[in-house]
Interface confidence: low
């Protein structure tokens, strides 16, 4: 069964996905797709990384964490009801049938009738660079709590402690993590 995440129309949705690279900078390709993970690859790819970089992304879909350290959590900006559904995070570990697949269910709720508080407006504006604040490198940025050392086949539910209080209430508090190597 998929882990469920919620967001309101007009907000940014956050879908957590992590792995621990065997060594810093020793990256594993990852794809994000709309729809449940198929046998191979991702269907309806919205974002893809390779061994170096994010090499494909589409409008409104971003990685905001330090993907070089394995934070490949997806942000979808300014969601609409049409963004509801299953999303696949596929960590493409070398070797036959070694991929780790995570299906995450996104539920979009209609926006509240009452005006959004200023904090929400700040959140939407700040979020695209939350973990990659210009002028601070990956080693210095505000970042998620350190990932536990777990085996490849283990999946851990993490409480993603975000130091920026403006963001904390807007993000879901669980995600999938694997360790490679």
């Amino acid at each position: 069964s998929e882990v469920e995440y919620r967001a309101e129309v007009g907000q940014n949705a956050y879908l957590p996905c992590f792995y621990t690279p065997a060594a810093p900078g020793n990256l594993v390709p990852v794809c994000w797709g709309k729809g449940a993970c198929p046998v191979f690859e991702c269907g309806n790819v919205v974002l893809r990384t390779d061994e170096r970089d994010v090499n494909y992304w589409t409008s409104r879909y971003w990685l905001n964490g330090d993907f070089r350290k394995g934070d490949v959590s997806l942000t979808i900006e300014n969601v609409t009801l049409a963004d509801s559904g299953i999303y696949c995070c596929r960590i493409q570990i070398p070797g036959i049938m070694n991929d780790e697949k995570f299906n995450l269910k996104l539920v979009i709720k209609p926006a509240k009738v009452t005006p959004a508080p200023t904090r929400q407006r700040d959140f939407t504006a700040a979020f695209p660079r939350m973990l990659t604040t210009r002028g601070h490198g990956p080693a210095e940025t505000q970042t998620l709590g350190s990932l536990p050392d777990i085996n490849l086949t283990q999946i851990s539910t993490l409480a993603n402690e975000l130091r920026d209080s403006r963001l904390a209430n807007d993000l879901r508090d669980s995600g999938a993590t694997i360790r490679i190597g």
């Epitope: 810093p24 900078g25 170096r52 409008s59 990659t132 490198g137």
Partner: antibody
Framework: EVQLVESGGGLVQPGGSLRLSCAAS????????IHWVRQAPGKGLEWVAD????????DYADSVKGRFTISADTSKNTAYLQMNSLRAEDTAVYYC??????????????WGQGTLVTVSS | DIQMTQSPSSLSASVGDRVTITCRAS??????VAWYQQKPGKAPKLLIY???FLYSGVPSRFSGSRSGTDFTLTISSLQPEDFATYYC?????????FGQGTKVEIK
């Protein structure tokens, strides 16, 4: 304070070589991409090459591919641009600049003061 | 390579004027566009990153926007220190490419 300081420029004959250095302070180059960007006299900016020091990944502009080599020594927190088979059209001020490895955010937030390379006989 | 076509190549304006510089990408670059200011004999300085984010320490009179593959740098009220050359840059793909520059001169 973040600083980038280039050195190694000068006058060289066509076909000659130069090695430029970019000494970084105030941050660890292992966490960033380091780029070289050049500007011919009275002209605009042209990206030359970049390196991601911790992964050793490099990219080059077609105009310098096979002639220039970018490298980095993380222990010295310094990036280098080895320029061989220099041509008159390589004459420019060469800047090193700091970028982020994620292409989506890879604007250059800190630049060195530049070093002039003149290729002339 | 992605071409960044910047216009105008130069403009004359007075202190207090609203100035707009545009850059058109030859293909989709998402929001991966930055704007820089350069003064004679100096290195460029980052003003705007990711199309519309104001870089730290840059005055709020500078702003950036995107409409498809068209990107705009606006200076809401030109100040004496703003007379310089401005460049756009796409960083969506390698190689990163710059516009040819816009020189903002005193009228």
């Amino acid at each position: 304070e973040v600083q980038l300081v280039e050195s190694g420029g000068g006058l060289v004959q066509p076909g000659g070589s130069l090695r430029l250095s970019c000494a970084a302070s105030g941050f660890n180059i292992s966490n960033y991409a380091i780029h070289w960007v050049r500007q011919a006299p009275g002209k605009g900016l042209e990206w030359v090459a970049d390196i991601t020091p911790d992964g050793g990944y490099t990219d080059y502009a077609d105009s310098v591919k096979g002639r220039f080599t970018i490298s980095a020594d993380t222990s010295k927190n310094t990036a280098y641009l080895q320029m061989n088979s220099l041509r008159a059209e390589d004459t420019a001020v060469y800047y090193c600049a700091r970028g982020y490895v994620y292409r989506m955010w890879d604007s250059f937030d800190y630049w060195g003061q530049g070093t002039l390379v003149t290729v002339s006989s | 390579d992605i071409q960044m076509t910047q216009s105008p190549s130069s403009l004359s304006a007075s202190v207090g004027d609203r100035v707009t510089i545009t850059c058109r990408a030859s293909q989709d670059v998402n929001t991966a566009v930055a704007w820089y200011q350069q003064k004679p004999g100096k290195a460029p300085k980052l003003l705007i990153y990711s199309a519309s984010f104001l870089y730290s320490g840059v005055p709020s009179r500078f702003s950036g926007s995107r409409s498809g593959t068209d990107f705009t740098l606006t200076i809401s009220s030109l100040q004496p220190e703003d007379f310089a050359t401005y460049y756009c840059q796409q960083h969506y793909t390698t190689p990163p490419t710059f516009g040819q520059g816009t020189k903002v001169e005193i009228k």
